[in-house]
């Protein structure tokens, strides 16, 4: 799996999308987990509804929400009020039994100020609202890591 980079602005909301084959993953719950080190486990942050039929319902854990379009085959994760400590490596997963298939590897980068980062596209940043439903989602900048880029810093 290549790693896709999603950039968001500190204090704003970042939306991460993970496309998947809806037929292959039919009937499976999904999860968003945080990678703990290069060889470490992926720690579950939030997962979709326990009843797969209700996967479209938004599930939350703290400032992170997840929803699944099982027909369209897109898992969407919203990180609200993005903070520097949210930066890091994550995975979108498809669950079956005690096993998990990786749908996408994600690197979340947190930008301090969009005006200082011309590569972020001079985004206009709306004010943060109080709830996920009303949150203005910052259009994320995403790219895949180039071949040879190291997703984790080498350990000494």
């Amino acid at each position: 799996h290549n790693t896709t980079v999603f950039q968001g602005v500190e204090g704003q909301s970042l939306q991460v999308s993970c496309p998947y084959d809806s037929m292959k993953h039919w009937g499976r719950r999904k999860a968003w987990c945080r990678q703990l080190g290069e060889k470490g486990p992926c720690q579950r942050v939030v997962s979709t509804h326990n009843l797969w039929l209700l996967s479209f319902l938004r599930r939350r854990n703290g400032s992170t929400a997840i929803t699944d379009d099982t027909l369209g085959g897109t898992l969407t994760i919203t990180l609200r009020n993005l903070q520097p400590h949210d930066a890091g490596f994550y995975q979108c997963q498809s669950l079956h039994g005690s096993e998990a298939d990786t749908l996408r590897k994600v690197l979340v980068e947190v930008l301090a100020d969009p005006l200082d980062h011309r590569d972020a596209g001079d985004l206009w940043v709306p004010g943060e609202s109080e709830s996920f439903e009303d949150a203005h989602v910052e259009h994320s900048i995403s790219r895949s890591l180039l071949e040879g880029e190291i997703p984790f810093p080498p350990t000494s």
């Epitope: 509804h49 326990n50 009843l51 039929l53 209700l54 479209f56 319902l57 938004r58 599930r59 939350r60 027909l71 996920f132 439903e133």
Partner: antibody, heavy 118, light 107 residues
Framework: QVQLVQSGAEVKKPGSSVKVSCKAS????????ISWVRQAPGQGLEWMGV????????NYAQKFQGRVTITADESTSTAYMELSSLRSEDTAVYYC???????????WGQGTMVTVSS | EIVLTQSPATLSLSPGERATLSCRAS??????LAWFQQKPGQAPRLLIY???NRATGIPARFSGSGSGTDFTLTISSLEPEDFAVYYC?????????FGGGTKVEIK
């Protein structure tokens, strides 16, 4: 503002069928679940089944399996609940409820009283 | 199916008092539990979802807690409009089930 408006009260004979409608206004109808819940006089709430209009997928409580059919018409943003082989114990207020974003019963219709009497 | 048992069946309190309602599940429902309020002749109204999250427009005096099999709905200071029947509901597993209800009445 999402609203659910149900059809009017019905009086039915034992053995017949009843079809109750639930029209949604506001919001996107297809993407959410519509459930049906009933409440017999002086009793608690009983879940009957749910439909996802987007896919037409439905799930029914085993107690009502074979007797209840839940359908949805996306063109009119209306869901229907048909209950057949009616008996006196089916006398109840029938509610439709839909998901908004967070849980399955976010928004409720006003209820439809169905009386089964000979 | 998962059975939800609510207690007490009736709670007699005065306005301004604290109400504590219990809901116990026959097996773990994780945090997939909601609370509803119903007044005579009206449809139920969602108060709490995911065990502890207040629904939009619900006053802060309503709070939910618990996880697994034991859940509590607390009304910190009863207002006259809070006297009603309260139901818990799980959607952890099919079929979706409701508790039998707790009636909060004026003492």
């Amino acid at each position: 503002q999402v609203q659910l408006v149900q059809s009017g009260a019905e009086v039915k004979k034992p053995g017949s069928s009843v079809k109750v409608s639930c029209k949604a206004s506001g919001g996107t109808f297809a993407q959410y679940a519509i459930s049906w819940v009933r409440q017999a006089p002086g009793q608690g709430l009983e879940w009957m089944g749910v439909i996802i209009p987007d896919s037409g997928t439905a799930n029914y409580a085993q107690k009502f399996q074979g007797r209840v059919t839940i359908t949805a018409d996306e063109s009119t943003s209306t869901a229907y609940m048909e209950l057949s082989s009616l008996r006196s114990e089916d006398t109840a207020v029938y509610y439709c409820a839909r998901t908004q974003e967070n849980t399955i019963f976010d928004i409720w219709g006003q209820g439809t009283m169905v009386t089964v009497s000979s | 199916e998962i059975v939800l048992t609510q207690s007490p069946a009736t709670l007699s309190l005065s306005p301004g008092e604290r109400a504590t309602l219990s809901c116990r599940a026959s097996q773990s429902v994780s945090s997939y539990l909601a609370w509803f309020q119903q007044k005579p002749g009206q449809a139920p109204r969602l108060l709490i979802y995911d065990a502890s999250n207040r629904a939009t427009g619900i006053p802060a005096r309503f709070s939910g807690s618990g996880s697994g099999t034991d859940f509590t709905l607390t009304i910190s200071s009863l207002e006259p409009e809070d006297f009603a029947v309260y139901y818990c509901q799980q959607d952890y597993e099919w079929p979706i089930t409701f508790g039998g209800g707790t009636k909060v009445e004026i003492k």
